[in-house]
């Protein structure tokens, strides 16, 4: 049972490794990064330039293609429920430092969570995205 | 309407202390990473400190490591920039700023002015 | 990272275009495909103002005349049409690695 627990370690590690998690990451983020000026309006000017690109037109062509190349690379996890948390675990990692602010963060893994779904792929049951190293904020 | 109001600056001789405060309104303060930035007299913009959130995380230029310190009181939704051994190259107007929450600096305070000199 | 703007003083006849070059020491393309880089307008007086973020998506109540370009380590600000409120200093700022600002542009109409 140990040998087998090192093995599909040792597995999981070259298919992390071998992954490129990247398409993941940028659908991601494209995903949650709506024009940041929904959150609060800035106080130089009372209204919305009506040339301002919608906040919910930020979903393009590239986008999908990037979820069609993360899904191709998650499915590589398919069968292993701990890897494929671990593979979420490092796109949160990679991540983290670029979310300023609780909501983007806490959106950031709502979508996470859910990729694996959107994917048509099974989700870990139990996966912990709380990214340890670099301290973030708890509360 | 997002407000930020910095206060606590003043003259100051080199070496000495001060505590500049901002006070925040109009969002939820303890939502965001928040940002010191400076200016000297006739010069450019200069990104002093950052504190995340809930405060775990600190960023400081180099120029002030060791000798600033940023906090920040979540409950009073206040920001704190405690700046030691200060020298005349401090000398600035002290911005605090808001994170849009994606590293970008979204909501300038209007500034405090802090003067070093003997 | 070292931000180099140009150029440092910008004279430009109203209603004319304007174009201020920002340039790192390296580049500023996170692996999410964003490049951190983002624009400000200083007016005499006043606070900085946010024009552009990750380097072309125009700030909620900036005229359209304001676009940003560009990726990796070279980045243009462009004014359409400079309009006699456009005065002031304009800075690029990264946000890749912690932040910093590039020295400013002074633009003055003629």
């Known amino acids: 049972r140990q040998q087998w627990e090192l093995q599909g370690d040792r597995r999981c590690q070259s298919q992390l490794e071998r992954a490129n998690l990247r398409p993941c990451e940028q659908h991601l983020m494209q995903k949650i990064q709506r024009d940041e000026d929904s959150y609060g309006r800035d106080p130089y000017s009372p209204s919305q330039d009506p040339y301002s690109p919608s906040p919910y037109d930020r979903r393009g062509a590239g986008s999908s293609q990037h979820q069609e190349r993360c899904c191709n690379e998650l499915n590589e996890f398919e069968n292993n429920q701990r890897c494929m948390c671990e593979a979420l675990q490092q796109i949160m990692e990679n991540q983290s430092d670029r979310l300023q602010g609780r909501q983007q963060e806490q959106q950031f893994k709502r979508e996470l969570r859910n990729l694996p779904q959107q994917c048509g792929l099974r989700a870990p049951q139990r996966c912990d995205l709380e990214v340890e190293s670099g301290g973030r904020d708890r509360y | 309407e997002v407000q930020l109001v910095e206060t606590g600056g003043g003259l100051v001789q080199p070496g000495g202390s001060l505590r500049l405060s901002c006070a925040a309104s109009?969002?939820?303060?303890?939502?965001?990473?928040m940002h010191w930035v400076r200016q000297a007299p006739g010069k450019g913009l200069e990104w002093v400190s950052a504190?995340?959130?809930?405060?775990?995380?600190?960023y400081y230029a180099d120029s002030v490591k060791g000798r600033f310190t940023i906090s920040r009181d979540n409950s009073k939704d206040t920001l704190y920039l405690h700046m030691n051994s200060l020298r005349a190259e401090d000398t600035a107007v002290y911005y605090c700023a808001r994170d849009s929450g994606y590293r970008s600096l979204l909501h300038w305070g209007q500034g405090t002015l802090v003067t070093v000199s003997s | 990272i070292v931000l180099t703007q140009s150029p440092l003083s910008l004279p430009v006849t109203l209603g004319q275009p304007a174009s201020i070059s920002c340039r790192s020491s390296?580049?500023?393309?996170?692996?999410?495909?964003?490049?951190?880089l983002d624009w400000f307008h200083q007016r005499p007086g006043q606070s900085p103002r946010r024009l552009i973020y990750m380097a072309s998506k125009r700030a909620s109540g900036v005229p359209d005349r304001f676009s940003g370009s560009g990726s990796g380590t070279d980045f243009t600000l462009k004014i359409s049409r400079v309009d006699a409120e456009d005065v002031g200093v304009y800075y690029c700022?990264?946000?890749?690695?912690?932040?910093?600002f590039g020295q400013g542009t002074k633009l003055t109409v003629l």
């Open positions: 700022m990264q946000a890749l690695q912690t932040w910093t």
């Open positions: 109009g969002f939820a303060f303890n939502d965001y990473t």
């Open positions: 504190i995340s959130y809930g405060g775990t995380n600190k």
């Open positions: 390296q580049s500023l393309v996170h692996r999410n495909g964003y490049n951190y």
